[in-house]
């Protein structure tokens, strides 16, 4: 999947653009908004009617090296009595993010962008019921 | 499990792991072969904490289109379709990495940017604060 060129006609390539080899792009890894923090409600993973656990994946050849993945604890949802209600479903909510991978090509090191699908949390949904004729 | 050492008082220094500027292959490797993100496309309507999806478009960013979730209700939807205000619909947020064109309008020069997106909503029991 190639990164699309800028589409609008008024986005002509400015003279100030750095020279880049064919088939490559220049990437500055100094992150904009580096210290931004998630401000989610407290402990929503345990307070949710579709609670989830977190697993940390760690990869020394990836930036960011740490990616946190959620897994729904139950197939059903937790009702007001604290019991699992299997007439409802806990389902994962997912979001794509980019990561940067450091790879080896022969004797040289190269960099590749990868799309990774992160499971962010879970939500409780009414199941889709298929009626058999 | 895996434990990542972390000093909460320090800024994230993980970027020590990568050079400040790198040349990257234009092709983006997509490893999501086993999971179909479209599978969750109707969850926003079927959830007990439903949400609306708002299109955020920015031609200076890759991906240029990001969908932002906004919870429809303060409470959660009951089986009878009514909203239960004893429960709360809350957004699930995620930090993601995107590419920002830098300098602006340049086709093949980018900088990594961390952005916060609301991906969907979940129904939670509220935190009750008892006043003495």
């Amino acid at each position: 999947r190639k990164i699309p060129k800028v589409g609008h006609t008024f986005f002509q390539k400015p003279e100030s653009c750095p020279p880049v080899p064919e088939g490559s792009m220049k990437l500055d890894t100094g992150i904009i908004n580096e210290n931004q923090r998630v401000s989610m409600s407290r402990n929503i993973e345990s307070r949710s009617t579709s609670p989830w656990n977190y697993t940390v994946t760690w990869d020394p050849n990836r930036y960011p090296s740490e990616v946190v993945q959620a897994q729904c604890k139950h197939l059903g949802c937790i009702n007001a009595q604290g019991k699992e209600d299997i007439s409802m479903n806990s389902v994962p909510i997912q979001q794509e993010t980019l990561v940067l991978r450091r790879k080896h090509q022969g004797c040289s090191v190269s960099f590749q962008l990868e799309k990774v699908l992160v499971t962010v949390g879970c939500t409780c949904v009414t199941p889709v019921v298929h009626h058999v004729q | 499990g895996i434990a990542i050492p972390r000093n909460s008082g320090c800024p994230n220094s993980e970027d020590k792991n990568f050079p400040r500027t790198v040349m990257v292959n234009l092709n983006i490797h997509n490893r999501n072969t086993s999971t179909n993100p479209k599978r969750s496309s109707d969850y926003y309507n079927r959830s007990t904490s439903p949400w609306n999806l708002h299109r955020n478009e920015d031609p200076e960013r890759y991906p240029s289109v990001i969908w932002e979730a906004k919870c429809r209700h303060l409470g959660c939807v009951k089986a009878d379709g009514n909203v239960d205000y004893h429960m709360n619909s809350v957004p699930i947020q995620q930090e993601i990495l995107v590419l920002r064109r830098e300098p602006r309008h340049c086709p093949n020069s980018f900088r990594l940017e961390k952005i916060l997106v609301s991906v969907g909503c979940t129904c939670v029991t509220p935190i009750v604060h008892h006043v003495a």
Epitope: W58, S65, Q71 | S13
Partner: antibody, heavy 117, light 106 residues
Framework: EVQLVESGGGLVQPGRSLRLSCAAS????????MHWVRQAPGKGLEWVSG????????GYADSVKGRFTISRDNAKNSLYLQMNSLRAEDTALYYC??????????WGQGTTVTVSS | EIVLTQSPGTLSLSPGERATLSCRAS???????LAWYQQKPGQAPRLLIY???SRATGIPDRFSGSGSGTDFTLTISRLEPEDFAVYYC???????FGQGTKVEIK
């Protein structure tokens, strides 16, 4: 020839410390992430810790978090594992392994650590 | 915590037969990779397969890996005498190993 040679194992009492070393040769050491994996007698493999090519990122198994520290000296082509507050359950053969991005492609022969009073 | 379950625990086969080893993950993650290792008594593990299906350098083509999501398979098309060993699967990224499958001579 790509080679990894571990050393520093031995018999140690519970609560004491030990430092393992791994000497690498035959490849550009500072280009690769490195790991420690252990195997208790008659048991399976357990990943212990890993470190990126330039020490910028480190990971630890929950079982050793806060007790073990992984480090490397690229100038000496060496990987280390500082093991503190050792327990009987840390008794194992400790392997040093090279990371090839998707797996561990080169392993040493291991060094034995025995924790016993 | 991610668990990799290998089956069967022991596989008793004769040289020339086909061996099929299974590895099931309790959770599938995008950006995690599955590898297979072979270990003989008194020896270090040896990488056979990485990224689910890619053969490591010097590994004979009788070894093949397949699978996706949570179910993975290592197949040895025709067992040679030197293939009798313990085989481990591993999820790179979560750093979990399976408990191993012993392939023994029948």
């Amino acid at each position: 020839e790509v080679q990894l040679v571990e050393s520093g194992g031995g018999l140690v009492q519970p609560g004491r410390s030990l430092r393992l070393s791994c000497a690498a040769s035959g490849f550009t050491f500072d280009d690769y992430a490195m790991h420690w994996v252990r195997q208790a007698p008659g048991k399976g493999l357990e990943w212990v810790s890993g470190i990126s090519w330039n020490s910028g990122s480190r990971g630890y198994a929950d079982s050793v978090k806060g007790r073990f520290t992984i480090s490397r000296d690229n100038a000496k082509n060496s990987l280390y594992l500082q093991m503190n507050s050792l327990r009987a359950e840390d008794t194992a053969l400790y392997y040093c392994a090279k990371d090839m991005v998707y797996a561990l492609d080169v392993w040493g022969q291991g060094t034995t650590v025995t924790v016993s009073s | 915590e991610i668990v990799l379950t290998q089956s069967p625990g022991t596989l008793s086969l004769s040289p020339g037969e086909r061996a099929t080893l299974s590895c099931r993950a309790s959770q599938s993650f995008s950006g995690s990779y599955l590898a297979w290792y072979q270990q003989k008594p008194g020896q270090a593990p040896r990488l056979l397969i990485y990224d689910t299906s890619s053969r490591a350098t010097g590994i004979p083509d009788r070894f093949s890996g397949s699978g996706s999501g949570t179910d993975f398979t290592l197949t040895i098309s025709r067992l040679e005498p030197e293939d009798f060993a313990v085989y481990y699967c591993q999820q790179y990224g979560t750093w979990t190993f399976g408990q191993g499958t012993k392939v023994e001579i029948k």
